[in-house]
Structure formats: C-alpha cells, structure tokens
C-alpha cells in the first residue's frame, strides 16, 4: 500500500496515569492515540507484552476500543503479583509507533495482622497513659485512629494526642478507663487491633494521718491512719525505719496502731505506709514517752575531814533527761551543772549532777538537797555532810571477806559471802552486772551478815556479782563471777576461815618518797595457813572514797607502793592469798604522808621547764573499749619539748553507784609514748579521761576530757 498524503504516524494524546488500586477492584489505565490509519494499541508491563481478552477471552484484562486497558479485578497475592508493575501503551500504524509515558500500577494492600497490638495499661490517676500501636503492613501506609469502648476518640480534646501510632492521655482520670482499639486504615479498608484495657487506679492518699503524741510511761497511745485508693491500699507500720518489734503493738481493723502500756523504748518515729500497685505513701508521727525522774544514784550521808574534798553523787534518769540542781537546806542559793564557778565558791555541779565541795569547812556541815525536775515530775533526795577534825578522818568500809568466783549447777544454791566492817558500820548491798540485785526475785535474799543467797539456780543467774559496803565515810566493793551450768556443784563451798591464811600483821612504813611508800609486814600468826602471795590496798581521802588495790601477787613481805601523790596522806592494809582465797585484812597502817614536791634539780631552769610544759598541747583521741574492763587511750602532741618525762593518764568514774570525783592516774613514763591501756575498769560504766604531760614535779596543761562507757558482758545462757 502506498503512502497517502493525509496519513500520519501515531501520537499519544492521552497518557496513562499512575494508579493505586485495591486488590480485587476494577481499574483502568487510559491511553488514547491519534494517527492515520487508526493505530493499533498494545500494552506492555515491565517490558513484556500484556495478555488481554484479545489473546484469551477468559483474561481479567480487557483492551477497550479507546485503547485503554481495563482490569475487571486486580489480581494480587502474597507472592504472585501479575498486575502490579510499570505499564506503557504502544500505538502503531504503518508509519511508525508511539510509546506513552510509564504509568505504575500499585496494588493497595492492608494486611490483617497488626505489627504491634496495643497492650493493657495500668496507670495511676493523674499520670499519663500511653497506648502503642503499629498498624498492619499496607500500601499506601495505613493511618490509625483509636476507639474507646467502640466509639471513635476525638483527639481534639487537649488531654489526648495521637502521634505516630501512640495514643497519649496526658492526665488520666477514672473515666478514661475502658477498652481501647487501634484502627488501621487505608484505601483497602479498616482493620481493628485486639482491644487493650486501660485501668486507671488511684494511688493511696491519706484521709487521716497519724499525729505526733506525747504520753507518760505506762499510758496507752493510738496512732490513727486512714487511707483511700484503688485498689484498696495495704497498710503497714514501721518504727524508726524498721519493722515493728513483735508483741508490743496491736493493729486494729482500721489500721490504728495501739500501744497498751508505753515504755521509754517505744519512743521514736512511727510511719504508716499505704501501698497499692500504683503508688506508695508514707505518713509519720513521733511518739515521745515521758518518764518521771528517777534516781540512778542517790546522794548518801558523808563524814569528811576539814580541808578535804567531798562529792555527793546524784545521777538521775527520765524522759526528758531531768534537770538537776542542788541547794543546801536553809539556803536560797541554787547550784546548777555547767554553771560558771563563782569566785571564792568551793561548790560545783558536774554535768552528770554530782555536787563537789572542795576545801571543806565546818560551816559546810548540813543537809544537801538534790532535786531533779522535768515536765513529767520532780524528785528530791537529801544527804547529810558531817565535818570532822582531820585527826578523826575515817576510812571507807573494809570488806573483811568478799564473794569468791564459783561454778554451780542448775537448781543448786549459791552463797556469795560479804562481811564488812567500818565506822560507822557499813550497809551491804549487791549488784549483778552493775545493776541493783536481787530486786523482786524471791529466790534471792541478803542474809544478816550480808551474804547473798540464790536458790534454785538458773543458767540466767550466771554473771558478775558485786558486794558494795557503804557508809558515810565511803564505799568499798568486791566482785565475783557466778557461773551456772548443768554440771556444776549443787551448793557453794562455804570456806571456813581455817581454810584461809591468817591476816598479816599491821604494815610498817620503812621508806617514803614523794611518789612511793615502802611497807613491810609479817605473815599471819603461827598456826594459820601459809600465804602464797599478798595484795596491798590503799586509801586516801583526797584521792578516792574507796579502798583501791595498789599491788597484786606480791611475793615478799617488803614492797614499795609507787604512783602515789606527793604530799598526800595514805592508809594501807595487806591481805594474804592462798588457793582457797583471801585472808581478812591486816590492821591498818598508821597514816603516812608522802613527801612534798622537792625544789627543782640543779642545772634545770624550772621557769623554762614550766614555760615549755605550758606550751605542750595534748590532743586526746576517742578512747576505744577493748574489753568490758579495759580501754585504750591514745593521744597526739603538737609540740614535743625537751623537758618532758612522760604523760599522766587521768581517769575517773562518772556513772554508777561508785561515781566519784577523784581521779585515778596511770603514768606513761616514756616521753615518746602516745598510748596507754586502762585495766581493771568496771563494766557498763562511764569514765572521764584526760592526759597531762609532766617533768619531775612540773605538770603541763590537761588535754580536753573524753568520756567512754565500758561494755556490759551479757550473761552466758
């Protein structure tokens, strides 16, 4: 056929457009071409010719007369995707062909399974709640909206925002609780997620909080605690951040904490803790248990020589700690602890309440009243001070025979001997582990001579027992350990005096220096048992109000007692020892005064010594309790002068029945020494300790005092 003048090659006048269509839906890809003769149209997908109904009448693709490609339904599977791709239409006639622009046919898709289903959420009211959702895979990418209890949520409410699959409720309310469904949607349709439950709980709140309370000992007390929340909170109580000790407390149905009979140990902070699965709240209140004042150590009558020093102990307890003050009967003048001492005043009150009067005058005689005062009550105690001439100075009581250590059987009987003498005649009392004994225990009695008898022994009776002989001239104590076991003796061996060595003769003074006294004595009278060793006891009114053991295990009948104070009057006694125990004491020595401080040695400028010593600054560290009866004392020295011989560790008891104002000394006689161990201390007692540098008779400034309390050994069960 020959070219006709009016013929022209094909040209595409309508190009197909990109289309996204749902699987199973019909769609059309348009294509219109001009040309003469009229061009034939064919379609190509991804470079391959597309089969239509022209090729197979059963085909789901139809070529329309206009040239458009019509799909009866889009076929698209998980794997086979025969309709998806890039299409072009080609128009042909004998003059040539024209190819349309590419048009992509994409199949919209929305799978059933959510990439992330929302999960149940539990929140506390007021907290934000976040429900997360990732819709099923789809094309175009599905958007989401949310339904609550099947009703679409309006995200215009300011508390609610929907961002990237997250539903956020900023400030949840009880009314927000319900079933939430995430809906994924695109042109294919909608898919509902599995529902998720939002539970809005309320954290615990207090309707009624416990309040601080102040009660007297033995009174009842209640702490109320009312709470609400959802779920109903559990309520528990704590005391001082620890679980409540068992047995002392009742917790009522409404969570009120009740203490029937308060004790001082009940004092503290009580915390009501309300907890549920969304929160925990705490409310606390303090309990103050007021205990009326009580005497721990009462002042006792004392007879003291003129010029001496006397201390009246007055130790009290209570809650709050009682304020203690003293007055002399008939005087308006009140004396308080820590009061700056008035010029010319010889009276002072220690922080623990002990009254000390120095340089006793006849006019000091009379009654002294210790008063203890708190909001919970007041108490008072009187003690008489008798002033005697120096010559009638009387030593403290002497314990002739004290208790012996013993091991006895359960259900057996203990006899703890204590025979004392003195002028005036002493009163005998007993302590167990430092505390008054026997109290109300009917098994224990103090017999006429002072012997302590304990029947039907129990393991718990094991302990250290102390006999205290007290009179107005002082007190003396003697301790022994009782060990109660299953296999001990059934009754105390009651040593006859014939089993013990006889008392030595009256000690004679053979030499005196400013710090020592040499004594000699004879063994007990012939016919008494021999002694294996001796002990020496000393007393000085200006040092202490009790006899002190100054030497132990002395093997000879001549001995120098060292570490004494210069210019001080001492009395000495000696006791003999054998395996059965201690003898009665020897008669007292005559009073002996140590030498006065001698003039300074030749060649030493005493002003220089005193100046240098005065510049030494001793810093005492906190003492360390090593055992119930030993304490380690350590110190540092800021400047070490050339004139220093050693350090005097001074200590005194400031609590307990034997509290005194007299210092005991332990000399560390090496200038380089910086520690010392105090031994033979009493258990469970507070000591005041200080350190003083010295050179010959010259003494430097005391360190600051430190206090330490020795421990109390628990009786073995």
């Amino acid at each position: 056929s020959r070219l006709r003048q009016e013929d022209f090659p094909p040209r595409i006048v309508e190009h197909p457009s990109d289309v996204i269509v749902s699987k199973g839906e019909p769609t059309t890809l348009n294509c219109k071409a001009e040309g003469r003769p009229t061009p034939t149209i064919e379609w190509y997908k991804d470079g391959e010719r597309v089969e239509t109904d022209k090729d197979d009448p059963r085909s789901h693709r139809m070529l329309l007369p206009s040239g458009s490609l019509f799909f009866l339904r889009i076929v698209h599977g998980r794997r086979s995707k025969p309709d998806e791709g890039s299409y072009v239409c080609v128009a042909r006639n004998y003059l040539g062909e024209a190819v349309s622009r590419n048009a992509s046919l994409e199949v919209a898709l929305l799978r059933d399974d959510f990439r992330q289903n929302p999960t149940d959420v539990v929140v506390a009211a007021g907290e934000p709640a976040i429900l997360e959702c990732q819709p099923p895979r789809g094309h175009p990418e599905p958007t989401i909206y949310w339904k609550k209890d099947k009703v679409r949520i309006d995200d215009k409410e300011e508390r609610i925002s929907i961002r990237g699959g997250k539903l956020m409720i900023s400030n949840t309310r009880k009314s927000d609780a319900g079933m939430y469904t995430c809906v994924g949607t695109n042109m294919v349709g909608e898919r509902d997620s599995d529902p998720a439950e939002l539970t809005v709980f309320e954290r615990p709140t207090f309707l009624r909080r416990p309040i601080n309370q102040v009660v007297l000992e033995e009174e009842a007390v209640e702490f109320r605690c009312q709470v609400q929340g959802d779920p109903q909170p559990t309520v528990r109580w704590k005391k001082d951040d620890a679980d409540l000790p068992r047995g002392r407390y009742d917790i009522k149905d409404d969570y009120t904490l009740r203490i029937k009979k308060t004790m001082s140990t009940d004092e503290g902070t009580y915390m009501c803790i309300a907890e549920n699965r969304v929160g925990k709240m705490e409310a606390s209140a303090t309990l103050t248990v007021r205990a009326p004042p009580q005497f721990v150590v009462r002042p006792r009558d004392q007879i003291v020589a003129q010029g001496r020093t006397v201390t009246f102990p007055c130790e009290t307890k209570g809650n709050p700690q009682p304020a203690v003050f003293w007055q002399k009967e008939g005087s308006q003048n009140l004396l308080f602890p820590n009061q700056p001492q008035q010029p010319n005043s010889r009276c002072s009150v220690s922080p623990t309440g002990d009254l000390t009067i120095t340089n006793i005058q006849r006019s000091d005689a009379g009654y002294y009243i210790c008063q203890a005062l708190t909001v919970a009550g007041s108490i008072l105690a009187k003690a008489q001070l008798e002033v005697t001439d120096v010559l009638t100075d009387r030593p403290p009581p002497i314990i002739l025979q004290g208790p012996a250590n013993q091991t006895l059987a359960v259900d057996g009987t203990a006899l703890l001997k204590c025979k004392a003498t003195g002028d005036p005649l002493p009163v005998i009392s007993w302590l167990k582990e430092g505390f008054t004994f026997p109290g109300r225990d009917p098994r224990a009695t103090i017999q006429e001579q002072g012997t302590l008898q304990i029947k039907n022994l129990r393991i718990s009776d094991t302990g250290t027992y102390t006999c205290v002989a007290t009179s107005s001239s002082g007190e003396t104590s003697w301790s022994a350990v009782l060990d109660v076991t299953e296999s001990g003796a059934t009754i105390s061996k009651n040593y006859d005096l014939s089993d013990l060595p006889g008392p030595p003769s009256k000690p004679q003074v053979t030499d005196v220096t400013k710090n020592s006294v040499t004594l000699s004595w004879q063994p007990g009278t012939p016919g008494t048992l021999p002694a294996s060793a001796y002990i020496i006891e000393a007393f000085s009114q200006s040092v202490s109000n009790s006899w002190q053991t100054v030497a132990n295990h002395v093997k000879t009948t001549l001995y120098t007692v060292r570490g004494l104070r210069p210019n001080t009057i001492y009395l000495f006694m000696v006791r003999a020892i054998n395996p059965q125990g201690l003898s009665d004491p020897s008669p007292m020595s005559d009073p002996v005064r140590t030498q006065d401080i001698s003039p300074p040695a030749q060649g030493v400028d005493h002003r220089q010594v005193q100046k240098e010593l005065g510049d030494v600054l001793v810093r005492l560290h906190n003492p360390v309790v090593l055992t119930p009866t030993t304490v380690q004392v350590t110190w540092t020295v800021d400047r070490q002068p050339q004139f220093i011989q050693g350090y005097r560790v001074m200590y005194r008891q400031t609590s307990g029945l034997q509290a005194t104002s007299s210092w005991q000394n332990l000399d560390a006689k090496v200038p380089t020494e910086r520690s010392a161990v105090l031994v033979n201390l009493k258990k469970g007692v507070t000591y005041e300790i200080k350190v003083r540098p010295y050179f010959n008779e010259f003494q430097g400034m005391d360190s600051e005092s430190k206090t330490v309390r020795t421990t109390e050994e628990a009786p073995s069960a």
Partner: antibody, heavy 118, light 105 residues
Framework: QVQLVQSGAEVKKPGASVKVSCKAS????????MHWVRQAPGQGLEWMGW????????EFPQKFQGRVTMTRDTSISTAYMDLSRLRSDDTAVYYC???????????WGQGTMVTVSS | DIVMTQSPSSLSASVGDRVTITCRAS??????LNWYQQKPGKAPKLLIY???SLQSGVPSRFSGSGSGTDFTLTISSLQPEDFATYYC???????FGGGTKVEIK
Amino acid sequence: QVQLVQSGAEVKKPGASVKVSCKASGYTFTGYYMHWVRQAPGQGLEWMGWINPKNGDTEFPQKFQGRVTMTRDTSISTAYMDLSRLRSDDTAVYYCARESGDDAFDIWGQGTMVTVSS
Amino acid sequence: DIVMTQSPSSLSASVGDRVTITCRASQSISSYLNWYQQKPGKAPKLLIYAASSLQSGVPSRFSGSGSGTDFTLTISSLQPEDFATYYCQQSVGLFFGGGTKVEIK
C-alpha cells in the same frame, strides 16, 4: 489458553539426579510464582518449593534444602526442577503449579513420573 | 512450620448426601486456606481459595468456611463425579493437609 506442560517420565538410579521441565503458555510467565509439588504412590501432596520467574528467587522447605534446585528460562517461559542424590523414596509424580494472585495453585501441569530404582 | 490436620482421612457417602470435611491449622492462618480436589491419575484441581471464595468454573454445591485455625469444606449434595480425594492447603507456608478420601457407600 493458560496451560503448563511438563516433560516425560524418568527412571533413575539411586544417587543420580533428575531435571523436570515445565513450559508455561497463555499468560505472562514472569507475573506468577511457579511451585513444585510431588505425590508418592498412594500418598498425599507434598510442597517442594517455589521460584519467582521474574528474578529467579527461590524458597524451599527445610526437607529439600541442599538437594533441590529450581531455575527458569524466561525466553522460553519454562521452569525447571532439579533433584539430586535420588533415593528410592523420591519415587513420585512431580507437578508444577502456578500460584494465582489469590494465593492458590490455580493451574497445574499434568505431572511427571520419576521412578528411582536400582 | 504450620501443620495442617485433616479429618476424617476417609469417609463413605451416598449421592445426594451432605458431606463435611474439616481442616485444622496448628496456629492461626487467618483466611489463607485453599481446598483442592484430586481424582486418581489426575493433577489436583483448585476448588476454594481464601477459605471461602469459589474458584471460577467450580459448581456452587462446594463451599468453604472458617478462619484462624478451623476450616470446613462442605459438599451440599454429593454427585457421582465428586468421589475423589480432597486436600486443604495453607497459603502462608504452602503445606498441604493429609487428605480426605470420599468413597461411595
């Protein structure tokens, strides 16, 4: 019309390999996945894997991995299944089947009997 | 792998009977389930796709139902040409059930 025509029966010795062909016609070969299914005498149908003729991607169940190979030649619209290291229990009728856009095997070949015998 | 369990493995029925075959998947497969009919010496033939859609050219006495894990093929009134073996197939992992042989009573 749309059809799949498979190669003829084969008799093989144990340890040998067999290659079965499947020629497609009447549709766009690259538009549909091709699967292979076998049926031992008196037994049920066992799916062996697929090939995407468009790009040659394949997938097989664990049981056949390492022993089966599936290939295609788009120029002649033919798919092939090669099974190596034959055993007597590989004796079966082997079918090729086209997967429709509805995720089902809508067109099947007539089957190829493969006998493995020493 | 998802395991397909068909029951019964065989059944006897008469022409005109209503026949039900069940197929259970070991885990949810949504609606991705197909049913095939196979006659002796012939290739299988697709009856139902996507659990309930009837393939073009298949008589309407065949119907499918179910989703998730439990599926059913029902022949409402058995015809002589329906005596054959029927297979279910899940189209996620493409495995077949064990088959149910429908025989003449």
